[in-house]
């Protein structure tokens, strides 16, 4: 048993260009707090996988208000260490996630709003009882400086906190076969007494009274070979009398997982999947209660009044996860219609509509042409929120009020010749093209999309078209 300790030294803008904007403002003062999540081994698990070694929340830091015009400084931090107690042996290798959270203290409806500001993660080797290890991690433009260590809780000592020490009974030396407890030379290593009858060949213990089995063995005293089938499996020691495998109980027999955890066999022994609020090898550790405020983003904590009962976070709209730590990207559902811009404000969704559209989801198409006339015979066209005039030949501009050279815009397609005329323009088409503006090839070459002037077209017979 022992405690992992984390000391945050600073959180602020990292070096280099692109300094982040201050997370707080005069209108929205805020304060920071931190969450640490520990997992055994060098796993690269997802952020939301269980913190099997434990988790901790810091206190809230001092309230900070940005000074207008000043660069974002290192932000004021909460006092004290983050401590994560561990009940079993310290694994030596571990993964960590450290999250920096911002609590906004403005005029929020329904209390303060929390948002994740930065998340750093890493995998480290660390012996218990060693000195503080210093670390610097960057998340985007932010930089987090911190130190950490693992220390054993008496009477445990050693790099894994599995050796036990007791004060010396005699001042001069330790008892027979027992060594002094480095670095506590005035204490002696205590003999580790396993459960009575624990197999010396197939069992071992890390704490007194325990009997843990080596791979391939099971039972309370590790005397029963593991097997999955009585006669069909070719593995395992066979019984001299039957030639069959001895049907030993599996590692999940009797369900070693506490607090409603579910057991699954692994190649080495077993694994417990723990319910929320519990962790540890057998789900026996419950380090988080509702009093610790485990529910982020305004989540409501239910149950978990004492360390032996699980808590459940009821998340507000827009958040999910066992601790309401994950923001639901509600804009990914594209709720805003007609090209509206989606804004997820946390407590609500807003759609910023394009011109010509209105309504909570931009579902109402306003009549862009209402009350807007196009001059000189032009026709008004609704064009995605901005009215547009399709002008009669010889006129141009937004409202067709400008007299234009009808041929200036090259209105004849496919190489047709344009002639200005009192009634507008006339296109003299190249051979093989038809239409008022030569836009129709008589015999296209069958391509799926032709350029403006497809090459190689033979002249058609204009007499065949009216």
């Amino acid at each position: 048993a022992g405690v992992f300790e984390l000391q945050i030294h600073s959180f602020g803008p990292g070096p280099g260009p692109g300094a982040p904007r201050s997370p707080c403002s005069a209108r929205l003062p805020c304060r920071l707090f931190f969450r640490v999540c520990l997992k055994p081994g060098l796993s690269e698990e997802a952020a939301e996988s269980p913190c099997a070694l434990g988790a901790a929340l810091s206190a809230r830091g001092p309230v900070y208000t940005e000074q207008p015009g000043a660069p974002a400084p290192d932000l004021p931090l909460p006092d004290g260490l983050l401590q994560v107690p561990f009940r079993d042996a310290w694994p030596g290798t571990f993964s960590f996630i450290i999250e920096t959270w911002r609590e906004e203290l403005g005029d929020q409806i329904g209390g303060p709003a929390w948002s994740l500001l930065a998340r750093v993660a890493g995998r480290r080797r660390l012996a218990a009882g060693g000195p503080w290890a210093r670390d610097i991690q960057r998340a985007g433009a932010w930089e987090l400086r911190f130190s950490y260590r693992a220390r054993c809780e008496p009477p445990a000592v050693g790099t894994a906190c599995t050796r036990l020490c007791r004060p010396r009974s005699a001042p001069s030396r330790c008892g027979p076969g027992l060594r002094p407890c480095a670095p506590l030379e005035d204490e002696c290593e205590a003999p580790l007494v396993c459960r009575a009858g624990c197999s010396p060949e197939h069992g071992f213990c890390e704490q007194p009274g325990e009997c843990r089995c080596l791979e391939g063995w099971t039972g309370p005293l590790c005397t029963v070979p593991v097997s999955t089938s009585s006669c069909l499996s070719p593995r395992g020691p066979s019984s001299a009398t039957t030639g069959c495998l001895v049907p030993g109980p599996g590692p999940c027999d009797g369900n070693p997982c506490a607090n409603g955890g579910s057991c699954s066999e692994t190649p080495r022994s077993f694994e417990c999947t723990c319910p929320r609020g519990f962790y540890g090898l057998r789900c026996e550790v419950s380090g988080v209660t509702c009093a610790d405020g485990p529910c982020f983003n305004g989540g409501l904590c239910v149950g978990g009044a004492d360390p032996d009962s699980a808590y459940i976070c009821h998340c507000p709209p827009g958040f999910q996860g066992s601790n309401c730590e994950k923001r639901v990207d509600r804009c990914s559902l594209q709720p805003c219609r007609n090209g509206g811009l989606c804004l997820d404000l946390g407590h609500a969704l807003r759609c910023r509509c394009r011109a010509g559209f209105a309504g909570p989801r931009c579902e109402h198409d306003l009549d862009d042409c209402a009350g807007r006339a196009c001059a000189n015979g032009g026709t008004c066209v609704e064009g995605g929120g901005a009215h547009r005039c399709s002008c009669a030949l010889g006129f141009g501009g937004r409202d067709c009020r400008e007299r234009a050279d009808p041929c200036a815009a090259r209105p004849c397609a496919h190489g047709g010749r344009c002639y200005a005329h009192f009634s507008g323009l006339v296109c003299a088409c190249a051979p093989g093209y038809m239409g008022a503006r030569c836009e129709f090839p008589v015999h296209p070459d069958g391509a799926s999309a032709l350029p403006a002037a497809p090459p190689g077209l033979r002249p058609g017979d204009p007499q065949r078209y009216l």
Partner: nanobody, 117 residues
Framework: EVQLVESGGGLVQPGGSLTLSCAAS????????LAWYRQAPGKKRELVAG???????VYFVSVKGRFTISRDNAKNSVYLQMNSLRAEDTAVYYC???????????WGQGTLVTVSS
Amino acid sequence: EVQLVESGGGLVQPGGSLTLSCAASGETVSFLSLAWYRQAPGKKRELVAGISTDGSTVYFVSVKGRFTISRDNAKNSVYLQMNSLRAEDTAVYYCYAYSWTTPRAYWGQGTLVTVSS
């Protein structure tokens, strides 16, 4: 990019009628010149009827009076109403759009019209 999707093709008896529809997306049809082409087996694709942005039309001489091209800018669609159909009208009919903003031509995938008794 303009996308064109034709519909309305099928089997019809000589003398019968059929209306082809073409829905355009990607650009407002007010700024497109639209047309119907057809391609009979073993023959070149040929213009059947076209309608310019100003509403002026052009028709293949053998369909004039039988076929009518029209456009509905509000529905972003162009139609070909075909009456008094003949066996020689059997072909794959293609929707065509000429974009004046690109400028470039676009084609639909085609719809089969079979006139047979």
